[in-house]
């Protein structure tokens, strides 16, 4: 084993290095001292370190470690943050296009239903946006609300134009009739199925990306324990106490220390792997009715078909509803 | 018969269904993200090694510091003997993860469970029992998956997927529809966001 080089007789080198860490030289001994009060850099002979210096080294070591950890995760963090933002924005754009397509369909095919239809469509797509972002909204309720709102307007404007402008009273009866008589056939149920499946998947996808950011942020800002700080100090700085300024830690030693310091963090590994593989599985299944882009941009067409379906059955419906909502209608005609 | 929404924009910019060779749709963007994420699948297990390779460490054939003294080769046993008066590496590992790490592990377990529940098994088909009583059946084909675009009559079955990058530059505005308060014109930054995605690694 090679003999250690003789320590700097004046601690001059140590002082000039330490000055960069901590301006003001009062903590560095003029000449090597016994260092009996040291707790981390236990000396085998005289040392150029004091207890105060050791504390500063520990603080610096932990800060270094935090910076290294942050730079390690920077690329991954940027990848997920940027994609989460891009997808959220893209989904909002899809929702906006879907809303515009649907409004355009009403304008072209059913001008008499506008502008009320625009408001109902607006409410529906507002709720779609909020659902994707994690709000506690029930998709079936959203779809029911859309058809419940549309039917009174369809009834009074398309099927029974002689009726005065619908009031809340008759509207409520018509809303009830809409469900009881399955006025739109199976279209509401079909839309519920497609919209709920595609939005659920979209929502969980965004939630997963946001959790990914949270995972990285958590490990990015970990505060390392005192024990870890001591190990890092011993690895990076204790050599300085002996005047060995240019010496680097052994590779194997570094790995052991890092595994010790990161034992807790490394426990995430198993769940992180599973997270990426599960996300991949989800993404592979995001097509057809599990793809919100596909579903929402086709909604205008399904809604159009549902209104045609009502018109096809208008005769039968008007008679039935005439009896069912007679009471409300009489009150309105008065 | 219904119309394609594009008919609306004849007077404005017609929405061309551009067949861009490398057009980036949402689904291609998702797959690209997964591929990039998979390159980070060993991120946490590789962290100790990564940090050592990015901090000053001696080359194999040079003298190095083992926490006690200068040595030619690192021996874990020797280093451990030197450390035993201080703190035990094994104890440090036994302490278990920080509370914040345990918390995030719980969240990961939860999302993984959700992701597995939501993942679509290959070949899963929608329930076929959508045709219940009503005035008439819902006018849809055999495979409900294909029923997104509604019935025939020149109506498209499924709207061509929004071109993730290409189409965003088009004006899909329905602002001229009275009562439609929503601004539909893509904001400048929407367009630039998507055009500047580049290859994020």
């Amino acid at each position: 084993q090679p003999p250690p080089p003789p320590p700097d007789a004046t601690c001059h080198q140590v002082r000039s290095f330490f000055q960069r860490l901590q301006p003001g030289l009062k903590w560095v001994p003029e000449t090597p001292v016994p260092g009996s009060d040291l707790q981390v850099c236990l000396p085998k002979g005289p040392t150029c370190c004091s207890r105060k210096m050791e504390e500063k080294y520990q603080l610096t070591a932990r800060l270094n470690m935090e910076q290294l950890l942050q730079s390690a995760s920077m690329e991954l963090k940027f990848l997920i943050i940027q994609n989460a933002a891009v997808f959220q924005e893209a989904f909002e754009i899809v929702v906006r296009h879907a809303k515009n397509y649907t409004n355009a369909m009403f304008k072209n095919n059913y001008p008499s239903l506008t502008p009320q239809a625009f408001e109902f469509v607006g409410e529906f797509f507002t709720d779609v946006s909020l659902y994707i972002l994690g709000s506690d909204i029930n998709v079936d309720d959203m779809v029911n609300e859309l058809f419940d709102s549309l039917f009174p307007v369809i009834y009074t404007q398309l099927m029974n134009p002689g009726l005065p402008d619908s009031a809340l009273d008759i509207n409520e009866c018509l809303r009830g009739a809409r469900r009881d008589l399955k006025v739109f056939g199976n279209f509401p149920k079909l839309i519920m199925t497609q919209v709920s499946k595609s939005l659920q998947v979209t929502r969980i996808f965004l939630q997963a990306l946001n959790l990914g950011i949270e995972v990285i942020n958590t490990t990015d800002h970990l505060k390392f324990s005192k024990d870890c700080g001591r190990m890092l100090t011993r690895m990076w700085y204790c050599s300085y106490c002996q005047g060995l300024m240019m010496v680097k830690p052994c590779g194997g030693y570094c790995n052991v220390v890092m595994q010790g310091c990161m034992a807790g963090v490394v426990e995430i590994d198993k769940y992180w792997r599973e997270y990426i593989l599960s996300l991949e599985e989800l993404v592979n299944g995001m097509y057809r009715i599990y793809d919100m882009e596909n579903v929402l941009l086709g909604l205008f067409s399904t809604i159009h078909d549902s209104i045609q379906y009502v018109q096809k059955n208008a005769g039968k419906l008007t008679t039935t509803i005439g009896k069912l909502c007679a009471h409300s209608q009489q009150r309105q005609y008065r | 018969s219904a119309y394609y929404p594009e008919d609306l924009f004849i007077d404005k910019k017609v929405l061309k269904v551009a067949h861009v060779e490398h057009e980036e749709t949402l689904s291609s963007r998702r797959r690209e993200l997964i591929q990039k994420l998979k390159s980070f699948i060993s991120f946490y297990s590789a962290l100790p090694g990564y940090i050592c390779s990015h901090s000053p460490v001696a080359e194999n054939d040079t003298l190095c510091w083992n926490g006690q003294e200068l040595v030619e080769r690192y021996s874990q046993k020797a280093a451990r003997n030197g450390m035993k008066n201080q703190f035990n590496l094994h104890e440090l590992k036994m302490k278990g993860p920080e509370p914040v790490v345990s918390q995030i592990i719980d969240k990961l377990k939860h999302i993984n469970q959700l992701l597995r529940t939501m993942s679509v098994p290959k070949g899963r088909v929608l329930d076929k029992n959508l045709d219940e009583e009503g005035f008439e059946s819902g006018d849809c084909g055999d495979d409900e998956d294909e029923c997104i675009g509604g019935s025939g009559d020149g109506m498209m079955k499924v709207k061509n997927q929004l071109r993730f990058l290409a189409e965003l530059a088009y004006d899909l505005d329905v602002d001229d529809v009275p009562g439609n308060n929503q601004q539909a014109t893509p904001k400048d930054n929407e367009i630039s966001t998507f055009h500047n995605l580049g290859n994020v690694h």
């Epitope: 009320q116 408001e119 109902f120 607006g122 409410e123 507002t126 709720d127 946006s129 909020l130 972002l133 709000s135 506690d136 909204i137 029911n144 609300e145 419940d148 709102s149 809340l168 509207n171 409520e172 809303r175 009830g176 | 308060n181 929503q182 601004q183």
Partner: antibody, heavy 116, light 102 residues
Amino acid sequence: QVTLKESGPTLVKPTQTLTLTCTFSGFSLSTSGVGVGWIRQPPGKALEWLALIYWNDDKRYSPSLKSRLTITKDTSKNQVVLTMTNMDPVDTATYYCAHSRIAARRVLDYWGQGTL
Amino acid sequence: QSVLTQPPSASVAPGKTARITCGGNNIGSKSVHWYQQKPGQSPVLVIYQDTKRPSGIPERFSGSNSGNTATLTISGAQPMDEADYYCQAWYSTIMVFGGGTK
């Protein structure tokens, strides 16, 4: 914390236009799911909803007053403005603005102090 | 004439349970919110989405909603609970308040 404050003239002549400003803090009208609504209450009477504006600039109006009302927002100033044309003595009331959580079925969870 | 019907007034002895109703055709399918308004003050949300209580609202306030009636219940009513109470629901694109119960 969330606070809202209404401001505007105390007195308006018949046929004139009333302009009310709601200045708020503690939230942003660019945040998804946020809205601001206007409600009025004639002396000794019930609350009556007037208008609601969403974060995405969607607007909803009371059908009976729709032709007279305009609601706008200035996100950078944290303000919402309501204008009501053709004022009449029956429009005498305390006018409140309120923060709305759109996702919670348009609940009004924070109210201003009101302006008479 | 409001589409949500509330009794104009209700009284209860201190410590007893007060119930205020809000009637509306099929109101059970709507989310109902309740506000308390004391003289000279702004309304305060006490129950939202039928049954949920905002933070800071005492546990004695609870709500339910089914069929054609939503109900606000104050169990163990206190003198400080004396106020006007309004129910509110969202009808498609319209916000509707009840006539209030004193």
